[in-house]
């Protein structure tokens, strides 16, 4: 089958890292600098992604794979494929149009990115506050007062941390 296919289309023999050069009688030519082909049989090589400015190169472009970028220190990636870099803030802050601002009372952010989120309302689960919340940390909920009978465990583990949302900038 491979042989038949290559008789029909000589380009199918060109491996990744090359392209089928119509200007040279369909010879397999290496991808030019700053370009790549990740699959065989390509008629052109794709231009490599450029990592510049607030982006830095996480993985160099090769003849068979694209470059990958991430953000310089003090910034974090947003969007598909790290399409945007956003400034980090400190824990206990969120990034607003006016820069990094402390979380309002009753909210927290335990990361350098994303938005401040409300403390967990322990009473909704019939529990009490075991450890108060801060700007950087959620409250820790403990058992309800009724559960604190002799022999009962005095601490229940906190619910698993939720995936923090983030506000795209």
């Amino acid at each position: 089958f491979e042989r038949t296919r290559s008789l029909q289309d000589p380009c199918s023999n060109c491996p990744a890292g090359t392209f089928c050069d119509n200007n040279r009688n369909q010879i397999c030519s290496p991808c030019p600098p700053n370009s790549f082909s990740s699959a065989g049989g390509q008629r052109t090589c794709d231009i490599c992604r450029q990592c510049k400015g607030v982006f830095r190169t996480r993985k160099e472009c090769s003849s068979t794979s694209n470059a990958e970028c991430d953000c310089t220190p003090g910034f974090h990636c947003l969007g598909a494929g790290c399409s945007m870099c956003e400034q980090d803030c400190k824990q206990g802050q969120e990034l607003t149009k006016k820069g990094c601002k402390d979380c309002c009372f009753g909210t927290f952010n335990d990361q350098k990115r994303g938005i401040c989120r409300p403390w967990t309302n322990c009473s909704l689960d019939g529990k009490s506050v075991l450890v108060n919340g801060t700007k950087e940390r959620d409250v820790v909920c403990g058992p309800s007062p009724a559960d604190l009978s002799p022999g009962a465990s005095s601490v229940t583990p906190p619910a698993p941390a939720r995936e923090p949302g983030h506000s795209p900038q």
Partner: antibody, heavy 116, light 107 residues
Framework: QVQLVQSGAEVKKPGASVKVSCKAS????????INWVRQAPGQGLEWMGW????????NYAQTFQGRVSMTTDTSTSTAYMELRSLRSDDTAVYYC?????????WGQGTLVTVSS | EIVLTQSPSSLSASVGDRVTITCRAS??????LNWYQQKPGKAPNLLIY???SLQSGVPSRFSGSGSGTDFTLTISSLQPEDFATYYC?????????FGQGTKVDIK
Amino acid sequence: QVQLVQSGAEVKKPGASVKVSCKASGYTFTSYDINWVRQAPGQGLEWMGWIGTYNGVTNYAQTFQGRVSMTTDTSTSTAYMELRSLRSDDTAVYYCARDAGPLDYWGQGTLVTVSS
Amino acid sequence: EIVLTQSPSSLSASVGDRVTITCRASQSISSYLNWYQQKPGKAPNLLIYGASSLQSGVPSRFSGSGSGTDFTLTISSLQPEDFATYYCQQSYTTPYTFGQGTKVDIK
């Protein structure tokens, strides 16, 4: 608050040069490249080039090679774009824009009119 | 250079309509496609980055989709303030390039 404030409108004669400034505030100037984009009357957006504010490296669109210079003054957080040998078809609004991947903040634009 | 072809170049629509604008790249740009709105006499305003991520402060009626070479901007229910010109732009590699724009006006 992130702001890019550009210099005022200019009227120039053909063959002259123009230098447009773009003063940044509300963020660390050297963290983001500055791009320049122009728009002729009633036309679309045309990318002119960028300057790396940290290292002064430039990359100009082919159309403007040899006629444009982009510079920065990090002490005043200001970027400059100079266009030389002006022609009537350089009449346009010139914008600076911060490069966070997309161009997330733009200056208000500077109208440059080239007329004899 | 990567060429971006936007369509249509103009469209007429009414308030409440669903509007779709497409942008096609001359080679794969993965998801590095941004959408801007521009009103007369004003600078462009970033709406969508990374093909589908909504910029902070932009109403949720705007959405973007696509990857590779074909991209779409959708306004789910057109509002009076949405009559403007929309541009796609690739931030995959320089020279950065823009689509030619789509003017959305009142029917």
